[in-house]
């Protein structure tokens, strides 16, 4: 793809960061719940 560099865009990066943040929050919540239930 001749314009491959443009796939590494800031908007795509922000979306990836938002997904990471969401997953971290969900996994963190699950972990806390597991600890609480022990």
């Amino acid at each position: 793809h001749s314009d491959g560099i443009f796939t590494d865009s800031y908007s795509r990066y922000r979306k990836q960061m938002a997904v990471k943040k969401y997953l971290a929050a969900v996994l963190g919540k699950r972990y806390k719940q597991r600890v609480k239930n022990k």
């Epitope: 314009d3 491959g4 443009f6 796939t7 865009s9 800031y10």
Partner: antibody
Framework: SVEESGGRLVTPGTPLTLTCTVS????????LSWVRQAPGKGLEWIGI??????SYYASWAKGRFTISKTSSTTVDLKVTSPTTEDTATYFC?????????WGQGTLVTVSS | AQVLTQTPSSVSAAVGGTVTINCQSS????????LSWYQQKPGQPPKFLIY???NLASGVPSRFKGSGSGTQFTLTISDLECDDAATYYC??????????FGGGTEVVVK
């Protein structure tokens, strides 16, 4: 984040290699550029490596610089035969033509 | 080869005022909007301000506004603050995976 290293004082004609070390993202999905700034001057784009594979250069930089991926976390900039005109701070920056992560830069001085 | 021309090279304005910086490209940028803006202070790396011509990067105040398309772009800074004193650069991305920077505009805040 990105971090540059390797800047030093060199004599004209002595090849020099600068290294950009990345963390927190994969080179296989990123575009990484080298940008330089001579003392008191503006920003000058040298070239870019896309997804760690293909390299593209500014027309003035072709043959003078080589950008290559050297490990899963490092990209090198080789200055083939430095001249005094290459004295500058060299920055590594992530992004495909829009640079959203910058390093602090590494200073290269070319002098006899 | 593409050329990005920034005007003016220097501009001075009072605190609370407005400055406008122009960036003209010799050819259309990728997708007609692949133009970004940066702020740089002495001894520091550039700071990413605006992407795809008009979108504000995270944490950048809404006093900064980017506009334009194709070959003609503008950065407007309103309600100027002392902290806005810096050099501003535009950068364009072009088909063929080529990038270029404008020559920079020094903003002096009085």
């Amino acid at each position: 984040s990105v971090e540059e290293s390797g800047g030093r004082l060199v004599t004209p004609g002595t090849p020099l290699t600068l290294t950009c070390t990345v963390s927190g993202f994969s080179l296989s999905s990123a575009a990484l550029s080298w940008v330089r700034q001579a003392p008191g001057k503006g920003l000058e784009w040298i070239g870019i490596i896309d997804k760690g594979v293909m390299s593209y250069y500014a027309s003035w930089a072709k043959g003078r610089f080589t950008i290559s991926k050297t490990s899963s976390t490092t990209v090198d900039l080789k200055v083939t035969s430095p001249t005094t005109e290459d004295t500058a701070t060299y920055f590594c920056a992530r992004g495909g033509g829009e640079f959203f992560i910058w390093g602090q830069g590494t200073l290269v001085t070319v002098s006899s | 080869a593409q050329v990005l021309t920034q005007t003016p090279s220097s501009v001075s304005a009072a605190v609370g005022g407005t400055v406008t910086i122009n960036c003209q490209s010799s050819k259309s940028v990728y997708n007609n909007n692949w133009l970004s803006w940066y702020q740089q202070k002495p001894g520091q790396p550039p700071k990413f301000l605006i992407y795809q011509a008009s979108n504000l990067a995270s944490g950048v105040p809404s006093r900064f506004k980017g506009s334009g398309s194709g070959t003609q772009f503008t950065l407007t800074i309103s309600d100027l603050e002392c902290d806005d004193a810096a050099t501003y650069y535009c950068a364009g991305g072009y088909s063929g995976n080529i990038v270029g920077f404008g020559g920079g505009t020094e903003v002096v805040v009085k």
